[in-house]
Structures are given as structure tokens and as C-alpha cells.
Interface confidence: medium
């Protein structure tokens, strides 16, 4: 859920802390570990029993501007014969990430932290069966 | 940097790229509300490549606790509920951005940090290496 209204700040404030206006935070967007790379097993998106495709979304007013989204290729899962088994379900694994949103209000610019939901990949699950009374 | 489209009527002093340091509102906006599927917490158990969640805590980071997925088995669960070692459970990893207090202990000064997390597991056909 959304982090709500600004209230009482209670930290023991070291003298070296930068001054910050009330209700806001100073954010350095030079990312720590910027060059770290994901070392996932090779092309798991194609080898998975719940395979997926990737699409890249681009928004110049967002930092980072590029966010990659996965989409499950099938409703069912791929069996040992390479056929879709609809008795099982391919489901998206979703995760939030933080981004910085740049907003233009007239000629002034403001920045907002935002949580964005990203689909990371898919997994194969046994379906939940609802029995009708 | 990232180029930003700008209102052509505004003074030209503004940088087109994101500045290195910005002041942001303490409220974190949630774009997901009512538009996306809600968190589904039981896939970890129902998956053919099930996983457990393990805790990693750092009080100078937001979020302070990160739960990492660890695949329960090397193989995948077959239709009989047994582990099939002809298939592999592998983690799905993703980079997320977190907030790191910088300088440490300062209440409202942060830096973005990229962290690699395992979010869940998926079942894949193994890569078979044939020895010559």
C-alpha cells in the first residue's frame, strides 16, 4: 500500500546530515551497484515449462526509463512431449521495484518515488479447484 | 543520462537529463492500486518448482527486510508429487531498487541501490553437456 502522510521524524540527527525540507527526502540517483549483472541460468524463459516473452517499456519521465516486463506464453504448462497441458497453469511471478517519476507542472519540475509492478517470469502451478456447492 | 521532453515555453536553464540528486516527496506512490493483480502468496507452495523464503535484514535500507526465494529441490515436482531430477528448479532473479541511507543514520537522505533478488523458481529442461 501507499506509504502515507509525513509525521513525526525521530532520528538522532547527526550534524553532518544534509538539510532537507519537511515532507521530502534527498535522493541520490547515482545507483550503487549500477553495473551488477543478473547471472540467471541461460535462456530460462524458453526452457521453462511455463515459458515467457519479454517486452521493454520505455518512459522518458521515469528513472530508470527502461523496465522489462515478462508475459507468460501459455495458459497451461509445457509437458515432456512439448505440448501444452491445460490441467496445470502458467502464472506470472510479480515483483515491485522503485522508480523515480519526474512530473512537469507548468515550468516547474517535481520528483516522486513510485512503486511499479514488474512481471519477472512465470512458474507452473497446480490450479486451485473451486467446487460449486 | 536520460533525456526528458520539456515544455518549449520554459526557460532553457533546465537540464534535459535527470539530475544526480533530487528532492522527492516522502510519500511513495503506488501505481499498482486497483489496476494490477494483487499479490498471490501461495504460488511458492503450488509451483512444480516450489520455494521457501529466507530473511535478510539491514536497518539502513528500505525495505529493511528482504525475503529471498530459495528453490526447495534441484528437480521439479511431477504429477505424482515426487521430485523428478530430469528437470531442474531454477531461481528467477531480478534487480530491484532499494533506498540506502547515505550518509548512514541520516533521517531523510538516501541513495538508490540496485539489489539482485530471487523472486521465485521455475521448472526448466536441463542443458545437457555431452562429453566428447
Amino acid at each position: 500500500r501507499k506509504i502515507p502522510k509525513v509525521g513525526h521524524t525521530f532520528f538522532q540527527k547527526p550534524e553532518s546530515c544534509p538539510p532537507v525540507p519537511g515532507g521530502s527526502m534527498k535522493l541520490d540517483i547515482g545507483i550503487i551497484n549500477e553495473n551488477q549483472r543478473v547471472s540467471m541460468s541461460r535462456n530460462i524463459e524458453s526452457r521453462s515449462t511455463s515459458p515467457w516473452n519479454y517486452t521493454v517499456t520505455w518512459d522518458p519521465n521515469r528513472y530508470p526509463s527502461e523496465v522489462v516486463q515478462a508475459q507468460c506464453r501459455n495458459l497451461g504448462c509445457i509437458n515432456a512431449q512439448g505440448k501444452e497441458d491445460i490441467s496445470m497453469n502458467s502464472v506470472p511471478i510479480q515483483q515491485e521495484t522503485l522508480v523515480v517519476r519526474r512530473k512537469h507542472q507548468g515550468c516547474s519540475v517535481s520528483f516522486q518515488l513510485e512503486k511499479v509492478l514488474v512481471t519477472v517470469g512465470c512458474t507452473c502451478v497446480t490450479p486451485v479447484i473451486h467446487h460449486v456447492q | 543520462g536520460i533525456t526528458i521532453p520539456r515544455n518549449p515555453g520554459c526557460p532553457n536553464s533546465e537540464d534535459k537529463n535527470f539530475p544526480r540528486t533530487v528532492m522527492v516527496n516522502l510519500n511513495i506512490h503506488n501505481r499498482n492500486t486497483n489496476t494490477n493483480p494483487k499479490r498471490s502468496s501461495d504460488y511458492y507452495n503450488r509451483s512444480t518448482s516450489p520455494w521457501n523464503l529466507h530473511r535478510n535484514e539491514d536497518p539502513e535500507r528500505y525495505p529493511s527486510v528482504i525475503w529471498e526465494a530459495k528453490c526447495r529441490h534441484l528437480g521439479c515436482i511431477n504429477a505424482d508429487g515426487n521430485v523428478d531430477y530430469h528437470m531442474n528448479s531454477v531461481p528467477i532473479q531480478q534487480e530491484i531498487l532499494v533506498l540506502r541511507r547515505e550518509p548512514p543514520h541520516c533521517p531523510n537522505s538516501f541513495r538508490l541501490e540496485k539489489i539482485l533478488v530471487s523472486v521465485g523458481c521455475t521448472c526448466v529442461t536441463p542443458i545437457v553437456h555431452h562429453v566428447a
Epitope: 502515507p4 509525513v6 509525521g7 | 494483487k38 499479490r39 502468496s41 523464503l53 528500505y62 529493511s64
Partner: antibody
Framework: EVQLVQSGAEVKKPGESVKISCKAS????????ISWVRQAPGQGLEWMGG????????DYAQKFQGRVTITADESTTTAYMELSGLTSDDTAVYYC???????????????????WGQGTTVTVSS | EIVLTQSPDFQSVTPKEKVTITCRAS??????LHWYQQKPDQSPKLLIK???HSISGVPSRFSGSGSGTDFTLTINGLEAEDAATYYC?????????FGQGTKVDIK
């Protein structure tokens, strides 16, 4: 294991204020928030508001807005809840509860109450 | 605000019996639903988080299921020490809200 220890019982007159403390030990105080939940005699649980320690921000249930103030002091790892303008309807047991600040199962915030104080009985009577 | 309605309000059960308590939300809350146990003159205790996640130290006879608007807490093989009031709690939307409670006693 996080432990939350609350201040003792209070007897107040209508119109007065009460301030209850909740001292946390074990775990990092910054790694979670504290919510306040009350329970009137023979009734269910009612959330009043909470503080998210990491950003030092608060939010309150509409019903208590303007009457409740939640604060925290990191140096003593203690959270406080002050309720003003007391009436007999505020007679209840008041609990503090820990709210984890987690990235859990792919999401940034979790909001279960995984540890509770022992409760503070507040009696409002003229 | 989101209203949680539990049923039944009261249940009298024989030891070793299976107990099922349901909680219905007035709108979709995904799996942001938690269950607590409260014994007389004690604080509530977390039993299940996020609809189905078990909590370490809680006996395995307690389990949870459901998503969206309909949730269930199941006690498989009730024991005498399980006599308590059980509450569901949603954290999807502020304000946090609780069900009215289900009192379980032993026959």
C-alpha cells in the same frame, strides 16, 4: 525475538488525555513500524494508526484523526500513542503491535502484526 | 473502508474435531489477509499471514486458504488449548480492519 512492553494501566476523567508507551527490544527498531490497536470491553479489535519508522511518518484511522498522535524515539526504542478528548467510549485495552518493513514475496511492504505488547487498560470515568 | 465479516460468530467444538472459520471481505484484497488468535486476558497472536503462510512456532494444525474476497482458517484436530477468539485482519487498504471475531470453545 522482538518484545514489546507497554506502560501500566491508566484511569482518566472525561476530556483528559492519555499517553501510552511501548518499549521495543530485540531486532532493529528501524526495521519495522508500530501500529496501535484498541479493544473495548467484550468487543473486537480496532486499528487506530501507526508509524513507519524508516521514514518517520504516521497515518491514522479517520475516526481518530485529530485526537490521536503517534510518535517514536529511536534513542530509547520506544513508541508512544497519545489520545486526547477522552470519553467513556475510549475505555479499552490499548495494544501496540509490530508491523514489519519487508520486501516479501516480491512486494515492498508487509502489514501483518507479528508481535504484540501486553496491552494497557485505560479507564475513562468521571 | 473494507468490511470483514466472519462466520460463525461462535462455535462449540469437540476435541480432535475439524474447525473451519470463514472471513469475507467487502472487496478484493488479494491475499492481504491475516489471522490472529486471542485467548482471554491475553494479547492477540499471529497465526497465519498473507492468507496461507504459516508462522514459525504455530502448530501445523492451523492452516489458511483463499484469496480475493473469501478466506478460510482451518484447525485440523482441535485441542483444548485452542479455545480462543479468532480474528481476520486485512492490510490491503488503509485503514486496517478486523473481522468481528469468532469465539471457539470446547464442548
Amino acid at each position: 525475538e522482538v518484545q514489546l512492553v507497554q506502560s501500566g494501566a491508566e484511569v482518566k476523567k472525561p476530556g483528559e488525555s492519555v499517553k501510552i508507551s511501548c518499549k521495543a527490544s530485540g531486532g532493529s527498531f528501524r526495521s519495522y513500524g508500530i501500529s496501535w490497536v484498541r479493544q473495548a470491553p467484550g468487543q473486537g479489535l480496532e486499528w487506530m494508526g501507526g508509524i513507519t519508522h524508516f521514514f518517520g511518518i504516521t497515518d491514522y484511522a479517520q475516526k481518530f484523526q485529530g485526537r490521536v498522535t503517534i510518535t517514536a524515539d529511536e534513542s530509547t526504542t520506544t513508541a508512544y500513542m497519545e489520545l486526547s478528548g477522552l470519553t467513556s467510549d475510549d475505555t479499552a485495552v490499548y495494544y501496540c503491535a509490530r508491523e514489519p518493513n519487508d520486501f516479501w514475496n516480491g512486494y515492498y511492504d508487509t502489514h501483518d502484526f507479528d508481535s504484540w505488547g501486553q496491552g494497557t487498560t485505560v479507564t475513562v470515568s468521571s | 473502508e473494507i468490511v470483514l465479516t466472519q462466520s460463525p460468530d461462535f462455535q462449540s467444538v469437540t476435541p480432535k474435531e475439524k474447525v473451519t472459520i470463514t472471513c469475507r471481505a467487502s472487496q478484493n484484497i488479494g491475499s492481504e489477509l491475516h489471522w490472529y488468535q486471542q485467548k482471554p486476558d491475553q494479547s492477540p497472536k499471529l497465526l497465519i499471514k498473507y492468507a496461507s503462510h504459516s508462522i514459525s512456532g504455530v502448530p501445523s494444525r492451523f492452516s489458511g486458504s483463499g484469496s480475493g474476497t473469501d478466506f478460510t482458517l482451518t484447525i485440523n484436530g482441535l485441542e483444548a488449548e485452542d479455545a480462543a477468539t479468532y480474528y481476520c485482519h486485512q492490510s490491503d487498504t488503509l485503514p486496517h480492519t478486523f473481522g468481528q471475531g469468532t469465539k471457539v470453545d470446547i464442548k
